[in-house]
């Protein structure tokens, strides 16, 4: 039985050659979270695990930075950043909860961040 | 092998303070929830609070009748969590057991306990 | 927050007898979320079985752990002098964690 939800920060655009911050939260559970992976599609961004710290996959390592938290910002910002971005906590004894995130990265100056919501 | 000491209980009056702190040794104290449970003379055992990892932003929680007065903390470089007590009441009256919790690891260990008693 | 009723209170049986301590949710608590304590006079509570009916290190097979939803039982197929104790049903489903009031097993 699985009770928690992921808070994302849902939709958001940014400037191209920017940066971003990318956040999640787990809440509505009492599980404990043994690690935390950013993925884009099917790409492993970073992750981070409750006793090793973070882990930035190597071909991502200059245009990510670990944090706030368990969030990650993505600097530099290409417009081929724009796609779906994942958080996936492992937990014990829920199991996995994911969050998704689309960004859009564009190359006007006016970008507006989205609103925030809720995946079960 | 973890051994988990408590200390700082004692005889305090009604609206005073007491400090508990419990130290471990033996583990990598960073990376375990810690919690404080009570056992009032003769009765039966109350979880007081939790705090969790720097992972988890040392996120904190009370039993209600504590919340307000009771703060949980954790120093990791000491190997210590302190639970400071204010406006002590009478029925505030037990013995207080530290305990270290790794649920993934089926880990579970509670010191020996010390004594507060709340008397006028 | 989910209170947990244990009973009976006191159950005093022979050494060699069967026991069976019963553990009742006010609602439902996830089987993984659910643990049991043995504690004996003036020593500090040990956890005994973890989710529902996983032994913990060092504790015989002769107990057991069952249960799910709202209803968890603890049995001890052949009581030994040794498990005469009080035991404790423990969750950690959801905020403030609770611990039943207690079942007392004593030599009849």
């Known amino acids: 039985m699985m009770t928690g939800t992921i808070e994302t920060t849902g939709n958001i655009s940014a400037e191209k050659g920017g940066s971003i911050i990318l956040q999640c939260h787990l809440s509505s559970t009492t599980a404990q979270v043994t690690q935390v992976n950013w993925e884009q599609q099917d790409q492993l961004l970073a992750i981070c695990n409750a006793d090793l710290g973070w882990h930035i996959s190597p071909s991502f390592k200059d245009r990510v930075a670990p944090g706030p938290g368990l969030g990650l910002t993505l600097q530099s910002l290409t417009v081929n950043d724009t796609g779906e971005y994942f958080c996936i906590y492992h937990t014990y004894p829920d199991g996995t909860y994911t969050g998704r995130i689309f960004l859009e990265v564009l190359e006007s100056s006016v970008a507006e961040h989205g609103a925030r919501f809720q995946i079960p | 092998e973890v051994q988990l000491v408590e200390s700082g209980g004692g005889l305090v009056q009604p609206g005073g303070s007491l400090r508990l702190s419990c130290a471990a040794s033996g583990s990598t104290f960073s990376n375990y929830w810690m919690n404080w449970v009570r056992q009032a003379p003769g009765k039966g055992l109350e979880w007081v609070a939790e705090i969790r990892l720097k992972f988890n932003n040392y996120a904190t929680h009370y039993v209600e009748s504590v919340i307000g007065r009771f703060t949980i903390s954790r120093d990791d470089s000491k190997n210590s969590v302190y639970l400071q007590m204010n406006s002590l009441k009478t029925e505030d009256t037990a013995v207080y057991y530290c305990?270290?919790?790794?649920?993934?690891?089926?880990?579970?260990?509670w010191g020996r306990g010390t004594l507060v008693t709340v008397s006028s | 927050e989910i209170v947990l009723t244990q009973s009976p209170a006191t159950l005093s049986l022979s050494p060699g007898e069967r026991a069976t301590l019963s553990c009742s949710a006010s609602?439902?608590?996830?089987?993984?979320?659910l643990y049991w304590y043995q504690q004996k006079p003036g020593l500090a509570p040990r956890l005994w079985i973890y989710s529902t009916s996983n032994l913990a290190s060092g504790i015989p097979d002769r107990f057991s752990g069952s249960g799910s939803g709202t209803d968890y039982t603890l049995t001890i197929s052949r009581l030994e002098p040794e498990d005469f104790a009080v035991y404790y049903c423990h969750q950690w489903s959801s905020y403030p964690y609770t611990f039943g009031q207690g079942t007392k097993l004593e030599i009849k």
């Open positions: 305990t270290m919790v790794r649920r993934n690891w089926y880990f579970d260990v």
């Open positions: 609602s439902s608590v996830s089987s993984s979320y």
